[in-house]
Interface confidence: low
């Protein structure tokens, strides 16, 4: 279409489509407007990834995607004169970015990370099939709160798995958790194919175990009061309370979704403290309690990782066997 083309005509393709990588896994495509576009055309750009996913119609000449670069990713871009999605865009121009070179069998596998108590991240992986046993691994990580890519210092081996931990402390009153951590594992010698992962901070969060503060009996109920792990607010957690009775040898597990300290028997105004009443507990027998917590979906997307169990606390008397 020449300079006098009607806006409904198909526009020329975009020019100078290029791709680059920022940080570890932020892929950025940029392009220039088409040459010879209709002068009375308000240009919009239609783009989608190779699998026709994430379609977007926008006036910006830029698109970015946070993606683990373990496989090739392509973006197709076309121009059009309106925001009408049914309008046929120009010929689509495609630009791809391929993962770093290397033998796919040499890349590490099962690369995954857990954010422990919102204070440090622990990543682990298995060696690739085609790697020598003395491979020196190195892990790089990046988060929006960091000025630059960092290297994880202490690589350790635990059984078949390699791993590394680095400090990543949740910052209060910020959008810290709304951004992911970008991870790359490779080796010092550059012999293996790098492996990437993107860890959303709203997932894979494992709290520390809670700390039981007090057990008491009131009107046939066992009142349990505990302190939540640091860094968490109680509305972001689910709880499980386990009570073992020595006499009946019963083992009861209670799922607690609300754990408010409303009763006068509970110690009041204790920050980050939760409470639960276990019904029908015999006070003249020994009852052993432990608690674990996990994040709930109101605060975190992933609610699968339970903390370890708390230390046990007991109340009551163990009856003599006579």
């Amino acid at each position: 279409g020449g300079g006098g083309a009607a806006p409904t005509e198909t526009q020329p393709p975009v020019t100078n489509l290029s791709v680059s990588v920022e940080n570890l896994c932020t892929v950025i495509w940029t392009w220039n407007p088409p040459e010879g576009a209709s002068p009375n055309c308000s240009l919009w750009y239609f783009s989608h990834f190779g699998d026709k996913q994430d379609k977007k119609l926008a006036p910006e000449t830029r698109r970015s995607k946070e993606v683990p670069l373990n496989e090739k990713i392509c973006l197709q871009v076309g121009s059009q004169c309106s925001t009408n999605e049914s309008e046929k865009p120009s010929i689509l121009v495609e630009k791809c970015i391929s993962p770093p070179e290397g033998d796919p069998e040499s890349a590490v596998t099962e690369l995954q990370c857990i954010w422990h108590n919102l204070s440090y991240m622990q990543c682990s992986w298995l060696p690739g099939r085609n790697t020598s046993p003395d491979t020196n691994y190195t892990l790089y990580y990046w988060h929006r709160s960091l000025e630059k890519i960092r290297q994880c210092e202490e690589i350790y081996k635990e059984g078949q798995y390699f791993g590394c931990s680095f400090d990543l402390t949740k910052v209060k009153d910020s959008s810290f958790e709304q951004h992911s951590v970008q991870i790359m594992v490779k080796d010092y010698a550059g012999k293996i194919k790098p492996s990437f992962n993107i860890v959303p901070l709203t997932s894979r969060v494992k709290p520390d175990p809670p700390h039981i503060k007090n057990l008491s009996f009131h009107n046939g109920d066992l009142h349990v009061q505990w302190e939540n792990p640091q860094n968490f607010i109680s509305r972001c957690l689910f709880y499980e309370v386990e009570v073992n009775n020595s006499q009946t040898e019963t083992h009861n597990v209670f799922s607690v979704q609300e754990a408010k300290c409303q009763n006068p028997e509970f110690e009041r105004n204790v920050e980050n403290t939760s409470c639960f009443m276990v019904p029908g507990v015999l006070p003249d027998t020994l009852n052993t309690v432990r608690i674990r917590v996990k994040t709930n979906k109101l605060c975190y997307e992933d609610d699968k990782l339970w903390s370890n169990w708390s230390q046990e606390m007991s109340i009551g008397k163990k009856r003599n066997s006579t």
């Epitope: 910052v171 009153d173 910020s174 959008s175 810290f176 709304q178 951004h179 607010i233 109680s234 509305r235 609300e258 408010k260 109101l298 605060c299």
Partner: antibody, heavy 118, light 104 residues
């Protein structure tokens, strides 16, 4: 459709008590914060406080701490803003608004005009 | 306590012109907690931008937000008649004092 519907305008005398309401619909009421924002005549917006209806956790701006009480009844998807003793300076438009965890107010009620005059 | 200062207090422009509104924080803040609102007389505010640069649902693309640290900007690329209103920036517990965009 997300909606926040506030109770009607109120005319009160200084020293009187008042409780205004904000009923949420079209979304999971317990999964979002509800905030209250004051706008005095001809003035800007002031953040008063928020409540998380799921557990009634509240947070107040230091300027409003002790001056008002924010509460919620999740069984009827309603949040409240109340005064035990109104002052003439409480005359303002009060808005409730839904707040996702990142702190912006994405849906607003229509506002409740409170007039305190002797 | 963080203070948000908006400038200018009033912006006099004609339809079709570009409007640039500034919001300065007294200390560095997380960009993802910075929001912009529009309020017209007799109406409730409306969320335009959250997270400093993300447009809220249904907001035309002539509105854009940018900035980080202490300096944030709301840009209206071409003013439409319905855009003349008061604009507020907000970061969690704090609102700016507002910028009035009026017809020149």
């Amino acid at each position: 459709e997300v909606q926040l519907v506030q109770s009607g305008a109120e005319v009160k005398k200084p020293g009187e008590s008042l409780k205004i309401s904000c009923k949420g619909s079209g979304y999971s009421f317990t999964s979002y914060w509800i905030g209250w924002v004051r706008q005095m005549p001809g003035k800007g917006l002031e953040w008063m406080g928020v409540i998380y209806p799921g557990d009634s956790y509240t947070r107040y701006s230091p300027s409003f701490q002790g001056q008002v009480t924010i509460s919620a009844d999740k069984s009827i998807s309603t949040a409240y803003l109340q005064w035990s003793s109104l002052k003439a300076s409480d005359t303002a438009m009060y808005y409730c608004a839904r707040m996702p965890n990142w702190g912006s107010f994405d849906y607003w009620g229509q506002g409740t005009l409170v007039t305190v005059s002797s | 306590e963080i203070v948000l200062t908006q400038s200018p207090g009033t912006l006099s422009l004609s339809p079709g012109e570009r409007a640039t509104l500034s919001c300065r924080a007294s200390q560095s803040i997380s960009s993802s907690y910075l929001a912009w609102y529009q309020q017209k007389p007799g109406q409730a505010p409306r969320l335009l931008i959250y997270g400093a640069s993300s447009r809220a649902t249904g907001i035309p693309d002539r509105f854009s937000g940018s900035g980080s640290g202490t300096d944030f900007t709301l840009t209206i690329s071409r003013l439409e008649p319905e855009d003349f209103a008061v604009y507020y920036c907000q970061q969690y517990e704090t609102f700016g004092q507002g910028t009035k965009v009026e017809i020149k």
